[in-house]
């Protein structure tokens, strides 16, 4: 990761993708340490911030403007050399977001996938973006970039992610950029949580008072396991919703969550999954499906338990 013999390594924390008005720390790592360094911007725009200045350990940039977007390099202090400075570092591209309308992000076949599968994340917009960028939250590496394909007044790009492993689970956002301003990105798409299932043993799902109930009768679905899951997730077939609850340790040494569905109006097939707090987007195998039947006069379904999963913050911790 570090630079060569006389080449520092320039990196950004927390990310090279910075929202307009945000801050970012640039670190110049040179010769097994963070020394004094100088910073350069390749297109030489916005240079007053670096004007003859030497920085110590890190440079905090911000609040950023579109003019901050571009390619940076640093030189480390090398007192006994002819120039006093090292060779230039690797190039580091800083991208500033929030400059155009947000694109949309969709997952095909969907955001809930089995380990080893491949998902296509499609970013699209009616703004004629030249490039699309896909970024996973919490990752400091540069985002993936694709050229936008334009059809019928829509620009889009398909990012293939897979085979899916736990490290690829998480919250994704995409951005677009227009010609001539490649590092001035749009506002982020709404976040899309990619969840990987099938990594741990399946929990069991049961219904109280039972899987067949009278219309209007209160129903509770219980998800439990011997595994010490922190969170249980309940999904209903045909709905892009998931409901989650913290697992509670029981006296029989199982971990359980009870999902009250309220008065029964309509049946459905339910599944539940377990997950751990440390990896909120990596779920267990699905429980066996549970068919809940309602006898009497079925009308509409139960009220939606949560917002659609792409916006529900599955991959954020449940506090």
């Amino acid at each position: 990761l570090m630079g060569g013999q006389d080449k520092p390594f320039l990196s950004a924390r927390p990310s090279t993708v910075v929202p307009r008005g945000g801050h970012v720390a640039l670190q110049c790592h040179y010769r097994r340490g963070f020394n004094n360094f100088m910073l350069y911007k390749e297109d030489r725009s916005h240079v007053p911030i670096f004007h003859g200045r030497i920085f110590q350990e890190s440079f905090i940039m911000g609040p950023v403007t579109p003019a901050h977007a571009g390619t940076y390099r640093c030189r480390g202090s090398r007192p006994h050399s002819l120039t006093g400075w090292s060779a230039p570092s690797n190039p580091l591209v800083i991208m500033v977001t929030g400059n155009h309308r947000k694109p949309s992000l969709l997952a095909h076949p969907g955001p809930l996938l089995k380990s080893g599968e491949t998902v296509i994340l499609q970013c699209w917009s009616d703004v004629m973006f030249e490039h699309f960028f896909l970024h996973r939250e919490g990752i400091s590496e540069d985002p993936s970039r694709l050229v936008g394909q334009i059809h019928d007044g829509v620009s889009k790009a398909n990012f293939s992610i897979g085979p899916l492993m736990p490290v690829l689970a998480g919250t994704y956002r995409c951005y677009g950029s227009v010609p001539h301003s490649p590092y001035q990105l749009s506002a982020p798409s709404d976040p899309l949580d990619i969840v990987i299932t099938g990594l741990y043993e399946k929990p069991s799902l049961s219904a109280q008072p039972g899987p067949t109930v009278q219309a209007g009768e209160n129903v509770t679905l219980s998800c439990s396991s011997w595994s010490s899951y922190d969170i249980y997730h309940l999904s209903r077939e045909g709905e892009a919703h998931e409901r989650r609850l913290r697992a509670v340790p029981k006296v029989n040494r199982t971990f359980q969550a009870d999902f009250p569905l309220g008065p029964a109006t309509h049946g459905g097939t339910y599944r539940c999954f377990g997950s751990f707090r440390a990896l909120p987007c990596v779920w267990s195998n699905s429980s066996d499906p549970l068919l809940v039947s309602v006898t009497g006069n079925p009308s509409s379904s139960w009220p939606s338990p949560t917002e659609p999963s792409s916006k529900s913050g599955i991959c954020r911790h449940l506090h």
Partner: antibody
């Protein structure tokens, strides 16, 4: 939303020390720095210096070297300003403000009044 | 140190007026100028940085311009809530320095 909350007013005797705290929330503390500014009664704004919350490296304006010390506790997203050997002329409102190497102070604390009087 | 001079200590305007604050730097500060608003009994608030970039949530009646050593902050249509002291600051080189402030009063 981004907030900086400072500790309460202080009344001190000349020669004493005071430590002002500034607790940040709503952003990742270590990706920005904390600037410190003071405002004497009825006067304008005077920059004391700043601390890089990522590296912990402080920088002081010439007039504030020695008696003024910045510190951080990143585990609780808090910056501190300690002033020792207080003098009557240190009586002022002390502000913390988020900002980095570019010197733009985009969010400010509510201010802490330090009164030095015998 | 760079000295920032706000020559007017006071400005008076009626609601709806256009008002301009001026600030002069003792040397070229390459557009690295910010403007702050401080209402009575409150902490300063950032309005403008890099001469003309409006901070998040700042109404578009506030705008900035300038280059070299001369900078201005304009309020296109003054509102009663704009009563405050306005400070310019150079963020070109340390020590960051502020102007003495201009107090806006409503007639």
């Amino acid at each position: 939303q981004i907030q900086l909350v400072q500790s309460g007013s202080e009344l001190k005797k000349p020669g004493a020390s005071v430590k002002v705290s500034c607790k940040a929330s709503g952003y990742t503390f270590t990706t920005a720095g904390m600037q410190w500014v003071r405002q004497a009664p009825g006067q304008g704004l005077e920059w004391i210096g700043w601390i890089n919350s990522h590296s912990g490296v402080p920088k002081y304006a010439e007039d504030f070297k020695g008696r003024f010390v910045f510190s951080l506790d990143t585990s609780v997203s808090t910056a501190y300003l300690q002033i020792s050997s207080l003098k009557a002329e240190d009586t002022a409102v002390y502000f913390c403000a988020r900002g980095g190497d570019e010197g733009v102070m985009d969010y400010w604390g509510q201010g802490t009044t330090v009164t030095v009087s015998s | 140190d760079i000295v920032m001079t706000q020559s007017h200590k006071f400005l008076s305007a009626s609601v709806g007026d256009r008002v301009t604050f001026t600030c002069k730097a003792s040397q070229d500060v390459s557009t690295a100028v910010a403007w702050y608003q401080q209402k009575p009994g409150q902490s300063p608030k950032l309005l403008i940085y890099w001469t003309s970039t409006r901070h998040t949530g700042v109404p578009d009646r506030f705008s900035g311009s300038g280059s070299g050593t001369d900078y201005t902050l304009t309020i296109s249509s003054v509102q009663a809530e704009d009563v405050a002291v306005y400070y310019c600051q150079q963020h070109y080189s340390t020590p960051w320095t502020f102007g003495g402030g201009t107090k806006l009063e409503i007639k």
